[in-house]
């Protein structure tokens, strides 16, 4: 039976030409996780896998940094990145997580975070 | 097109260290990370370990670590296997692919470089 | 370390037979299994990705299917050009390959 919950940072906002950083938590599991995917809509964005690290895919690599933790870094934002990105949790035994977080990309200088929010 | 171009064959006597590289064309190797694989004659494959050619960081498997090390001239767009201590065992042919671009799986190899361990 | 057990060991086939390989994870993987064919004396050749996800320029002939525990890579009419060893490979942990089938003529 899955119990874990996973917890986002939500729906953020950024600058356009700032960096953002994505974060996701599991909690209440004591399920191993083996892998955490980041996607953007169907687009994977980056692998860390528990033995074999990090893997950016190239398209992402010169603006896309690992961490902290098992979170990414988005660097010179385009209003392009605004969308979509999922946070997917490959656990043993439990099986997948994913959550959810809506990044927009802000053209003025007026950008606040949003509340916390979970996806159970 | 997109290549890994691998070294010549090597033979070596035991307790020796090899060097062996792999040269990329087609793509610059700071964008994509490079594997290597070593298949025994009649054996299957295993994978020894990995290279981020953008920023040096290695992962090996645990069967290959202090026996193997990874390193790349990324002006040359090269990657090198070192073996060091070699036995018999160490007798195969070595892959290095590269890995895929949406994951661990490797969707370009060079040809092979064989090394043979023999006093 | 996951380990894969691919059967069977061996296949032997007719020209236009179609044939399911087997690999087999010794605890779930997900969907982090791929596929690779090697001829004799040649380089592994990546046939599927992510259990199922086909790869340019392979034929669509070649398919694969599963997740978890248990994968099929599917050939819909064999072809005298795909006769040699098939490997799967996982990336859930420590990457690792099962020890191959080999298809041949019979």
């Known amino acids: 039976m899955m119990t874990g919950t996973i917890e986002t940072t939500g729906n953020i906002s950024a600058e356009k030409g700032g960096s953002i950083i994505l974060q996701c938590h599991l909690s209440s599991t004591t399920a191993q996780v083996t892998q955490v995917n980041w996607e953007q809509q169907d687009q994977l964005l980056a692998i860390c896998n528990a033995d074999l690290g990090w893997h950016i895919s190239p398209s992402f690599k010169d603006r896309v940094a690992p961490g902290p933790g098992l979170g990414l870094t988005l660097q010179s934002l385009t209003v392009n990145d605004t969308g979509e990105y999922f946070c997917i949790y490959h656990t043993y035994p439990d099986g997948t997580y994913t959550g959810r977080i809506f990044l927009e990309v802000l053209e003025s200088s007026v950008a606040e975070h949003g509340a916390r929010f979970q996806i159970p | 097109e997109v290549q890994l171009q691998q070294s010549g064959a090597e033979l070596v006597k035991p307790g020796a260290s090899v060097r062996l590289s792999c040269t990329a064309s087609g793509f610059n190797i700071k964008d994509t990370y490079i594997n290597w694989v070593k298949q025994r004659p009649e054996q299957g494959l295993e994978w020894i370990g990995r290279?981020?050619?953008?920023?040096?960081?290695?992962k090996y498997a645990p069967k290959f670590q202090g026996k193997a090390t990874i390193t790349t001239d990324t002006s040359s767009n090269t990657a090198y296997l070192q073996l060091s201590s070699l036995t018999s065992e160490d007798t195969a042919v070595y892959y290095c692919?590269?890995?895929?671009?949406?994951?661990?799986?490797?969707?370009?190899w060079g040809a092979g470089t064989t090394v043979t361990v023999s006093s | 370390d996951i380990v894969l057990t691919q059967s069977p060991a061996s296949l032997s086939v007719t020209p236009g037979d179609s044939v399911s390989l087997s690999c087999r994870a010794s605890?779930?993987?997900?969907?982090?299994l791929h596929w690779y064919q090697q001829k004799s004396h040649e380089s592994p050749r990546l046939l599927i990705k992510y259990a199922s996800q086909s790869i340019s320029g392979i034929p669509s002939r070649f398919s694969g299917s599963g997740s978890g525990t248990y994968f099929t890579l599917s050939i819909n009419s064999v072809e005298t050009e795909d006769f040699g060893m098939y490997f799967c490979q996982q990336s859930n942990s420590w990457l690792t390959f099962g020890a191959g089938t080999k298809l041949e003529l019979k």
């Open positions: 290279i981020d050619p953008a920023n040096g960081d290695t």
């Open positions: 692919p590269k890995s895929g671009d949406y994951g661990w799986y490797f969707d370009v």
């Open positions: 605890q779930s993987i997900s969907n982090n």
